[in-house]
Each structure stands twice: as C-alpha cells, then as structure tokens.
Amino acid sequence: MSKPHSEAGTAFIQTQQLHAAMADTFLEHMCRLDIDSPPITARNTGIICTIGPASRSVETLKEMIKSGMNVARLNFSHGTHEYHAETIKNVRTATESFASDPILYRPVAVALDTKGPEIRTGLIKGSGTAEVELKKGATLKITLDNAYMEKCDENILWLDYKNICKVVEVGSKIYVDDGLISLQVKQKGADFLVTEVENGGSLGSKKGVNLPGAAVDLPAVSEKDIQDLKFGVEQDVDMVFASFIRKASDVHEVRKVLGEKGKNIKIISKIENHEGVRRFDEILEASDGIMVARGDLGIEIPAEKVFLAQKMMIGRCNRAGKPVICATQMLESMIKKPRPTRAEGSDVANAVLDGADCIMLSGETAKGDYPLEAVRMQHLIAREAEAAIYHLQLFEELRRLAPITSDPTEATAVGAVEASFKCCSGAIIVLTKSGRSAHQVARYRPRAPIIAVTRNPQTARQAHLYRGIFPVLCKDPVQEAWAEDVDLRVNFAMNVGKARGFFKKGDVVIVLTGWRPGSGFTNTMRVVPVP
C-alpha cells in the first residue's frame, strides 16, 4: 500500500497517530504511538448495548444513543414477549426523537439474543430465591427424577437435560452457575450421577449448567426459541444473536424458522463451546456474522485459551469480510463503579486492535449503576484503539487475501480504500441500497469513516455491524434524474460529515457511486474536495 504524503491536505485524520501509521514495520509502528496524538471524531467500531431495567426507559435510551449506542440487544433468556415489545417500542421512540434533524439522526438497530439450548438446574427447596451452600469435598447427587424438580438441596440436584448420563463419563467435570461451582462425576447410573463438589459456593435456583467436552445433543432451536424468533420477525428486529451455535445446520435451522418474512434478518452466531470453535469455518460460512461469546466459552474451554479463540475467530471473520462482535465482561466492573479497571480498558482496546467490528456491553448497561458512563467509556477507548491500528500492514494483507475478482463493486472498493489512504481522505462516501457496497469497502478497513447513504432504514440499521460504516438515512424523495439524485445524496453525506466533524471545507473525500439505479452497479470512484 502506498503511504500517505506527510504534507497531504489539512485533514483531521493527520492527528490520528499519523506518524506511527507511516512506519515501515509493525515494531516501529508501536514505538511511534503517541499518547498526545488525538483520534479523529468518528468512531469506527459499533457499540452494542444490552437493554434491561437500568436502561429501558425512553429518556435513558435517548442518552445512550447520544453517548454512542448503535445496537440495542434484548436478551430473551429473561422477560416476557410483552416486556420485550415494550423495550423495542421504547428504543424506537428514543431513536425517532432525533428524526427532526436528518443530519444528526442515528438509526439504531434492534438485536434479539436467543436463550438457546441451555441446561438448567431445578428450584432450591421450591423457591426461586432460596440458596444452599455446597461445601468442597461434599457428595452431590444429580438426578433426572422429576420428583426433585422443585426440591433441590445440598444433597440432590435436579436438572433438565435428560441425556446427561449418556454424554458424561466418570471423571467428567460439570460446571454450574457460570462455572462458579464445579463438580466431578464419581459414579454413573441410568438416571442419576454421583458427583463430588470440587469448587463449592452458594447455589441458587434455575442456574445454567455447562458440560465441557461433552457431545450435548440438545436441539439447536428450542420451542421457546421458535416462538421468540417468530416474535422477532413480527417485531421487525434487525438481527438475531443465535446462542450456542455448534455447527452450520444449527444456523440453517434458525434461518428456516425466520422463514420468508424474516429473510432480511441478519443471523449472528454465538460461539460458546468447543464444538463451535472446532467447526468455526462451516458456521462462519452459514452465518451473516459471529459473536465471540467469551462468557460460556471461558467455561467450556480453558480460560487461558479464550484469547486464542478470540484472535482466531476475529481473524477468520476479517478474512471472510463478515462482521464479528466481541462480547462479555468488557467493562464488567462498571456495573458497580463509574470507572473501569485498567485491565478492562486494555481488553476493549485489544478487541478493537484484534479487528472486532463491534464491542458489546451486557450487565454494564442492562442492570449496572453507570450505563451511560459505560457506553461513553467504550466509545473513547474504541476511538483511541482505532487510531493505533497499523493500517499499512492490515490493508496490504486484506488485499492480498482477497480473491481475484471481476466484480466491479469489489474492485472499486479496494481502489477507494487505497485512494483514501493515499490522499488522507476525511471520509469515504458510499451510496448503497442493500448495503453491499458499503460492506465491501468496510472489509478493507480504511482509516476514514465510511458514510453509507441509503434510503432503506433496515440497511442503515444493519450497517452498524460493520467496522467503519457510519450509516445515514436519506429521507428526501427520489429525484427523477438519476444524476441529480446521486448529487442529492452525496451532498447529504457531505453535510453530515461536516456537521459531525469528520472533515471540513478543503479536505478531500472519496465518493463511490453506481452508473445506474438499483443494487449491484457501484463502479465509479471520485476524489472530491469538500465544498
């Protein structure tokens, strides 16, 4: 890749670690990183926020949108359809409250996160709130006998997976409640297991169970998931985060349930166990994107290997040009504290440096005391990390890995990104109907934000999944003359970019357009000075 001219223009982008960006080697690039070099205004990484009691009011949602939330995640492990319908309504009300100013309006996507095929324990002594203490070294019998479904205690524990005795062996580990409690199987019966408590603790009702290494044969899509997915179609959600995906056929089953009416919903597969990691390539091929769900993954595979899985999955998604989300415990301490730990700050930054398209908040925004601060913190860290990416090497590798193609859109995308580096462009403006042109540009990871202009609201919302895309929704009526309509949308993008501080008069931007109306015709790249 050609290096940018150091004297090129006066674009804001020059303060974005430009000295480091021009280094000849990765080590030299690291040596040149400068804590006093401010990042540009735009943040390229998407921020996904889980909505819960701490954040579901319209007022809080408005503030979260202002703070940088791009996607609202609804966790269907909890809550009724009525509860989630209300949340969706609130997200849309908050989003549309900014609609009066098309230049500052931000489309916010809605994501439905499925419960998935979970294994859960029964009720402790008939109560949803009761707890018992499991002592290290104690014997605990696991039973499938429904008589104990609501009568679990420190001696006997019922769980809802009927085949557990077939899939675990003597010596197998069983983890309960996010791995806080660990049991080792000592004896197997037809419908019971005798285990020893290896790691004790307080056990509550209906806790999740993990069976690392076991070939768990639960259906990919439970009856509850089916109803939830259909509810999602009815509610017009933009994406599904499909839990515990283990193989490609699981993804196809989700796609089948979404049906014809849900054809446009993106399926993001959550990789949460060893089988999912092992069969990653087939899952990636079947999915629209991937979520590195580090919570369950860290129980199902050794904790010290989670970072390897993260890097591998992000790398393969980047290579394939599919979006990847990094999730779980990113700013966990901010549930209770207004500032993250230094380790959490580094974790967010390193996810961005690894190449994640989006970063996610869970309890931080759903139930935490500082939801807005958590969003703002992710925004600030992501911006700094993006400035520190060694684009010289990254673009070179992405370009080399891309197959030779005669697809005009693909070729134009590569050229646009290269040109944007060469002339330090303030942005790349893309006119897109389906979003494909913008996705292809994003695949090559430009430093400049990609302002994707579309008239399709869902295209705009779904574009947040891709690193670098800043979607803007054009609501102006279509002009009769195609060239005039192109100019209208490009000018709209120019106004948005200037209002947002992405560039100013005299900077240059790259503009990508088609040669005729419709999808699939993007083939024209122009370098345009900002008027």
Partner: antibody, heavy 116, light 111 residues
Framework: EVQLQQSGPELVKPGASVKLSCTAS????????MNWVKQRPEKSLEWIGR????????LYDQKFQGKATITADKSSTTAYLQLSSLTSEDSAVYYC????????WGQGTTLVTVSA | DVVLTQTPLSLPVSLGQPASISCKSS???????????LNWLQQRPGQSPKLLVY???NLESGVPDRFSGSRSGTDYTLKISRVESEDLGVYYC????????FGSGTKLEIK
C-alpha cells in the same frame, strides 16, 4: 407443537360464495406469511396467494385475482380464504400453509360445487 | 415471476434403486444473505404436503438421510439413494424467494 386446523368440507351451489378458515394453535401467526394453495384431483399444487397477518397486506397470483380474498384475524390466530362466484372449476382441496421453515400445512378443506 | 420447471413429470423406479428429480428455475433463487430459498415437499397419496428439504440442501428433522438436495447454478436436484415403498407420492420443488412458488410436481411410482 404447531398445528394448522382447517374448517370442514363444503358443498356449495354454483354462483355462491364460501369462506374457509385455518386456525394456528401453539403459534402466533403474525411472525409469518399465511399462504393458501389449491389442488384439484390428480393435479399439481397451485398457489392462490398469501397474507401478512401482522398488517393485513395480501398478494395474489394473477389467476386468482377477483376470485379469492384472503384475510386474517390476529387475535384468533386464524386466516380465511373467501371464494366467490363458484363454478365446477373451483371444486378442489384447499390447503393453508405457512412458511414456518418452508411450510407447515393444514389438513386441507374439500370444496365441491354441485348443481341443485 | 419465477418459473420452476420440474422433470420428469413421472418417475417409475424399482424399490431399492436410486431416484433423482430435477427442478430448473428461470432465475437465481440465491437471496442477498447468500442463502438459496428453494425447498422440496413430499405429498403422499391422500395426505397434505410435507417439508423434506429446505434452503436447497438442508434435511428437515425426522426426514431419512436417504434424501438429499443439491444445487448447481439455477438447477436443483432431489435425490433418493434407495427408494422405499413409503417414498411413493408426488414431489414438488417450491421457492420462497418471491411469490408463485410451486414446480409442476414429479410423481414417483413403482416400476
């Protein structure tokens, strides 16, 4: 388990109208499209049209425009097919189906038009 | 509208032998998400149709693995590796890419 229960057989006079029903149980129909399909004896399946029960939008094969009207009632999770100006050509089995993973089918309703 | 052309209209086959049904589409059924919106249905005599294969090549749960679906461009094929008596009936290709979905059907009968 999702099931589609269709109304019983109909014996009707030529020129009359008829309204067939299809009720989904264990399922909220607004998350899918409901299709109606015609099958004459020993013949292939013919698509009549479909409805989006969430908003009432319907779509018909040109051949059935003016002949068929598809409606839905969200609250009772029921879809309806009304056929007007019946002739012997309309005698067939009518199926409701939704794309619940590429179609869940009702058991079919037999319609026979008979002269007085 | 998409036109699905199914061949043959009738397929006499001996039990235990393989069978192959073809369906040609007048246009691509690959949607923008990269998936192929073509399914195969089976209709046994006197029964409602039932889903066999979805998204061109995925077997519906409970369907025997002697059935398989494949795609080559706009040509789709349903194969039965060894025909059994319960397989007799009419097979339809059906697309959910756009409306007017059905092929003309192929009747599988015993030779």
């Amino acid at each position: 388990e999702v099931q589609l229960q269709q109304s019983g057989p109909e014996l009707v006079k030529p020129g009359a109208s008829v309204k067939l029903s299809c009720t989904a149980s264990g399922y909220n129909i607004t998350g899918t499209y409901m299709n109606w399909v015609k099958q004459r004896p020993e013949k292939s399946l013919e698509w009549i049209g479909r409805i989006d029960p969430a908003n009432g939008d319907s779509l018909y094969d040109q051949k059935f425009q003016g002949k068929a009207t598809i409606t839905a009632d969200k609250s009772s999770t029921t879809a309806y097919l009304q056929l007007s100006s019946l002739t012997s050509e309309d005698s067939a089995v009518y199926y409701c189906a939704f794309d619940y993973g590429g179609h869940n089918w009702g058991q079919g309703t037999t319609l026979v038009t008979v002269s007085a | 509208d998409v036109v699905l052309t199914q061949t043959p209209l009738s397929l006499p086959v001996s039990l235990g032998q393989p069978a192959s049904i073809s369906c040609k589409s007048s246009q691509s059924l690959v949607y923008s998400n990269g998936k192929t919106y073509l399914n195969w249905l089976q209709q046994r005599p006197g029964q409602s149709p039932k889903l066999l294969v979805y998204l061109a090549s995925n077997l519906e749960s409970g369907v025997p693995d002697r059935f398989s679906g494949s795609r080559s461009g706009t040509d789709y094929t349903l194969k039965i590796s060894r025909v059994e008596s319960e397989d007799l009936g009419v097979y339809y290709c059906v697309q959910s890419y756009t409306h007017v979905p059905f092929g003309s059907g192929t009747k599988l009968e015993i030779k």
